[in-house]
C-alpha cells in the first residue's frame, strides 16, 4: 500500500479581512492512525492554528465532519480573517506515539494572503496659523492596509498637487502598511474656503478612493487692511471718522482709536460682513469734538488681528480749520460704535 | 448547551478503589478528549490523564499511572476515571474537562479516610 | 516534564490597582499551547487566556496574557472585587500536562 501523502491543493489562497478563509487538505490514506493539526509557519516556534483533539479555536471550524471513521478530509475554515492572519498554512499528519504523538508528514503549505482596506485618510494642518504667500505643510496618514500598493494623490480644490513626498512602511515584509504623505502648499489671500484632499486608492477599494480632507480656513490668517477717512461734518464741532477693516481672516479683531497717542476707546468685533471670498469686513468710527482741542489731533485705528502684533492706520484732523468753542472739555463722544457694513 | 455532569462525592476506606463517572451532552463526545483533574484541599492543580472516546487512546500522568484507569462508553457519551489503592493523600475534588479546556464538569469529592 | 513555577503565590492588591502575575516554565513552551484559568472557591476552573494571549468568550478586557518561551504573563489592569481568585497557568505542549502552583490574589 502507498504511504500516506498529505495534499494541500491550493498553494495560496487571497481573503478579504473579516471574511472567513478555506484551507483545504487531504490526506491520501487512513494509516498510520493519528490527528490532523494545522500549523502557522514552519520550525519549533510555528503557531498551533487547530488540534482536531485538544485546545481552543474559536474560530475554527472543520468542513467535514472529523470524527467520522473513513474521513480523509482535513480542511479548515477560519473566520473573521485580519491581516495578523497572513501566512504559511501546514496540514500536518501525527502518528500516535508516547507520550507524544509524532509528526508523521507535512502538506506542501497554502499561502494564505488578506486583503485589507486603509482606515481613512486623516488629514492635519500646521499647529499655527500661516498668512498668504506663505507655503505650509499637510500630513494625511492611513493605515491596516494590505496588499503594499497603494496610490495617494493630493488636491487643492480639485487641482492635483505635485509638490509631495510619501511614504509606505514598513519597508520589508509584513501583515499590514501604513503610508504617511506630506504636501506642501502655498497659502493665497483667497485660501478661506479652500480645501486640501488626500486621496488613497488601492485594491480593497474597487476603484472608490478614500479621501480625507481639511480646510484652507483651519490654517490660513488674512490680515486686514486699514483705512481711516474723515466723513462729512455730522454736527458744529463734531468729526465723524472712520476705521474701515477690510479683507480680514478669522474674525478674531479688537480696535483701538488713539487720540494723540491716548487711548480713547477699544472694541472687538462683532457684526462682521462676510466677503465672496470668506474674509470679513469690518468698520468703526468715532464723533470727534475739534472744539476741545487747540492743535491739531492725530488719530490713529489700531488693531490687533488674531493674537498678532498690532497693525495701525492714522489720520490728522485739522483743528484750525473748525471753530472752537470755549469752555468745552470733551474730547470725544464715545457713543459707541456703529457697526455699519462698508464694502 | 455543553454540559459535563459528575457524579456524587464518595467516601472510600484506604486501600480501596473509586469510580467517578462524567456525562456529556451539548456536542459530539467523540470530538475531542475528556481530561481529568485531581485537587486536594487548599492546592492546586493536578493533570491525572486523558482519553480520547473516538478510539479509546489515552495518556496518563507517571505520578498516577499505575493506579488511574481512565474509559469512555460512547454509547452513553459517559468517560469514567477510576483510582485504585486509594491514601489519605487521594481525599480531593476531581473534574473531568473538554479537551477544549473550557467545559468543566461541577466537580467530584472523594474522601479517603479509615 | 515541564514544570510552570507562578509568582507571587499570594498578591495582595486593593480593588482599582493593576495584577501582574508571572508564569515561568523549565523549558520552552509554544505560546499556542500556555493557558491561564481563574479559580474561585468551590468551583471548577474558568478559562480566561488561551494560546498566551487570546481573550477568551466572555472575559472581560481588564484580563489580558503576554510572553513567549519560558516566560508568561497575566496582568489585570484595574482589579474589580469580583477578580479576587486563585490563578493557574497550563501548559499542554507536552505530556504530562501541568499547571502552576496557582497565585492567590487577595484583598489588602
Known amino acids: 500500500e502507498e504511504e500516506l501523502q498529505v495534499i494541500q491543493p491550493d498553494k495560496s489562497v487571497l481573503v478579504a479581512a473579516g471574511e472567513t478563509a478555506t484551507l483545504r487538505c487531504t490526506a491520501t490514506s487512513l494509516i498510520p492512525v493519528g490527528p490532523i493539526q494545522w500549523f502557522r509557519g514552519a520550525g519549533p516556534g510555528r503557531e498551533l492554528i487547530y488540534n482536531q483533539k485538544e485546545g481552543h479555536f474559536p474560530r475554527v471550524t472543520t468542513v467535514s465532519d472529523l470524527t467520522k471513521r473513513n474521513n480523509m478530509d482535513f480542511s479548515i475554515r477560519i473566520g473573521n480573517i485580519t491581516p495578523a492572519d497572513a501566512g504559511t498554512y501546514y496540514c500536518v499528519k501525527f502518528r500516535k506515539g508516547s507520550p507524544d504523538d509524532v509528526e508523521f508528514k507535512s502538506g506542501a503549505g497554502t499561502e494564505l494572503s488578506v486583503r485589507a482596506k486603509p482606515s481613512a485618510p486623516v488629514v492635519s494642518g500646521p499647529a499655527a496659523r500661516a498668512t498668504p504667500q506663505h507655503t505650509v505643510s499637510f500630513t494625511c496618514e492611513s493605515h491596516g492596509f494590505s496588499p503594499r500598493d497603494i496610490t495617494l494623490k493630493w488636491f487643492k480644490n480639485g487641482n492635483e498637487l505635485s509638490d509631495f513626498q510619501t511614504n509606505v512602511d514598513p519597508v520589508g515584509e509584513s501583515v499590514s502598511y501604513s503610508i504617511h504623505s506630506t504636501a506642501k502648499v502655498v497659502l493665497t489671500r483667497e485660501d478661506v474656503h479652500s480645501q486640501v484632499i488626500c486621496e488613497v486608492a488601492h485594491v480593497t477599494l474597487q476603484g472608490d478612493p478614500l479621501r480625507g480632507t481639511a480646510n484652507l480656513s483651519e490654517t490660513i490668517r488674512v490680515p486686514p487692511t486699514l483705512e481711516v477717512t474723515q466723513q462729512p461734518v455730522r454736527a458744529e464741532n463734531q468729526v465723524n471718522v472712520t476705521c474701515q477693516v477690510r479683507k480680514f481672516y478669522p474674525q478674531r479683531l479688537q480696535l483701538t482709536w488713539l487720540e494723540n497717542g491716548n487711548v480713547s476707546r477699544t472694541e472687538t468685533a462683532s457684526t462682521v460682513t462676510e466677503n465672496k471670498d470668506g474674509t470679513y469686513n469690518w468698520m468703526s468710527w468715532l464723533l470727534v469734538n475739534v472744539s476741545a482741542h487747540r492743535d491739531d489731533v492725530k488719530l490713529t485705528c489700531q488693531v490687533e488681528h488674531d493674537g498678532q502684533p498690532a497693525v495701525s492706520k492714522s489720520h490728522d484732523l485739522k483743528v484750525s480749520a473748525h471753530p472752537k468753542e470755549q469752555g468745552s472739555n470733551t474730547a470725544a463722544e464715545n457713543t459707541g460704535s456703529n457697526e455699519r457694513n462698508i464694502y | 448547551e455543553v454540559q459535563l455532569v459528575q457524579s456524587g462525592a464518595e467516601v472510600k476506606k484506604p486501600g480501596a478503589t473509586v469510580k467517578i463517572s462524567c456525562k456529556v451532552s451539548?456536542?459530539?463526545?467523540?470530538?475531542?478528549?475528556i481530561h481529568w483533574v485531581q485537587q486536594a484541599p487548599g492546592k492546586g492543580l493536578e493533570w491525572m490523564g486523558r482519553i480520547d472516546p473516538a478510539d479509546g487512546d489515552t495518556k496518563h500522568n507517571p505520578k498516577f499511572h499505575d493506579r488511574v484507569t481512565i474509559t469512555a462508553d460512547t454509547s452513553t457519551d459517559t468517560a469514567y476515571m477510576e483510582l485504585s489503592s486509594l491514601r489519605s493523600e487521594d481525599t480531593a475534588v476531581y473534574y473531568c474537562?473538554?479537551?477544549?479546556?473550557?467545559?468543566w464538569g461541577q466537580g467530584t469529592t472523594v474522601t479517603v479516610s479509615s | 516534564e515541564i514544570v510552570l513555577t507562578q509568582s507571587p503565590a499570594t498578591l495582595s492588591l486593593s480593588p482599582g490597582e493593576r495584577a501582574t502575575l508571572s508564569c515561568r516554565a523549565s523549558s520552552s513552551v509554544t505560546s499556542s499551547y500556555l493557558y491561564w484559568y481563574q479559580q474561585k472557591p468551590g468551583q471548577a476552573p474558568r478559562l480566561l487566556i488561551y494560546?498566551?494571549?487570546n481573550l477568551a468568550s466572555g472575559i472581560p478586557a481588564r484580563f489580558s496574557g503576554s510572553g513567549s518561551g519560558t516566560d508568561f504573563t497575566l496582568t489585570i489592569s484595574s482589579l474589580e472585587p469580583e477578580d479576587f481568585a486563585v490563578y493557574y497557568c497550563?501548559?499542554?505542549?507536552?505530556?504530562?500536562?501541568?499547571f502552576g502552583g496557582g497565585t492567590k490574589v487577595e484583598i489588602k
Open positions: 494560546s498566551a494571549s
Open positions: 474537562a473538554t479537551g477544549n479546556y473550557v467545559n
Open positions: 497550563h501548559q499542554w505542549y507536552s505530556y504530562p500536562r501541568t
Open positions: 451539548g456536542f459530539n463526545f467523540e470530538d475531542t478528549y
